[in-house]
């Protein structure tokens, strides 16, 4: 749809790419919801956080996550249009000292408590897939995205450009 000849084309260098510095260039708070407007919520259970995908009641407050944007070290000019910008990676933190992590072995998305510098599993390449939606691709596993499966977040392999706009890997960011 966007002249993509496969996900790998844009992220093949992810395994080798490092983050410029240890400080994000930009941070802000936003709530995260699915393409179908279900909210991503976080609950403390038995001293660990669980992540849920659920419909909120009308006046129920949405959980916010801190989105931190980091520049990759090398310009990502694979697109062929002479773009000289640096690829952006994000980390997502719903509460202090906890970050979303990709567990590639279990194909799951988990909240881990950790100190900076954050591990590679906490970084996701940001994509604009579809109108006002974004997607999050694992830095540690190109072609694998955060997605929704059985009312939970999971890691979903996307193996062709046609599947890039599949609804279960599309998310909306909202500041309200």
């Amino acid at each position: 749809a966007f002249g993509i000849s496969g996900v790998q084309k844009y992220t093949r260098a992810l395994h080798d790419s490092s983050i410029t510095g240890i400080s994000p260039i930009t941070e802000y708070l936003a709530s995260l919801s699915t393409y179908n407007d279900q909210s991503i919520t976080f609950a403390l259970e038995d001293e660990s956080y669980e992540i849920y995908v659920e419909d909120l009641k009308k006046d129920e407050k949405k959980d916010k996550v801190l989105l931190s944007y980091y520049e990759s070290q090398h310009p990502s000019n694979e697109s062929g249009d002479g773009v000289d910008g640096k690829m952006l990676m994000v980390t997502l933190s719903p509460t202090k000292d906890f970050w979303l992590h990709a567990n590639n072995k279990e194909h799951s998305v988990e909240l881990h408590k950790c100190e900076k510098p954050l591990p590679d599993q906490a970084f996701f390449v940001l994509h604009n897939m579809h109108s006002n939606c974004v997607s999050f691709e694992c830095k540690t596993d190109p072609g694998v995205f955060i997605g929704v499966k059985d009312n939970h977040l999971a890691l979903i392999k996307v193996d062709s450009s046609e599947n890039l706009c599949t609804e279960n890997i599309l998310f909306k960011l909202s500041e309200t």
Partner: nanobody, 121 residues
């Protein structure tokens, strides 16, 4: 190619005001956020303010209540209204945007060349 062009910098007295503008152009498909950073001589570049596509904003503590960021989505332009300027606001102000192009879904970070703001009597 994506270009960011800043304007509006200059010399202003303490307590004065300036309005910076930054226009993004090129093969832009979606802009996620636009913001301003600054770099004073001998210091690291720091975030001043950012405004997201949804209208959310974030400000550095040092400029809260004095600076206001806004954007015009129709023109892919961001503005920084700077009031009650102080000597310590003297810096080169850089526009930064996160955007994707028509040829790639990957969101990239783009920077302008910078505009100098000098606050001095």
């Amino acid at each position: 190619q994506v270009q960011l062009v800043e304007s509006g910098g200059g010399l202003v007295q303490p307590g004065g005001s300036l309005r910076l503008s930054c226009a993004a152009s090129g093969s832009i498909r979606t802009v996620n956020y636009m913001g301003w950073h600054r770099q004073a001589p001998g210091k690291q570049r720091e975030l001043v303010a950012v405004v997201t596509s949804g209208g959310g904003t974030n400000y550095a503590d040092s400029v809260k209540g004095r600076f206001t960021i806004s954007r015009d989505d129709t023109k892919n332009t961001v503005y920084l209204q700077m009031n009650s300027l102080r000597a310590e606001d003297t810096a080169v102000y850089y526009c930064n945007a996160a955007a994707s192009t028509y040829s790639s879904t990957v969101v990239r970070s783009f920077w302008g060349q910078g505009t100098l703001v000098t606050v001095s009597s």
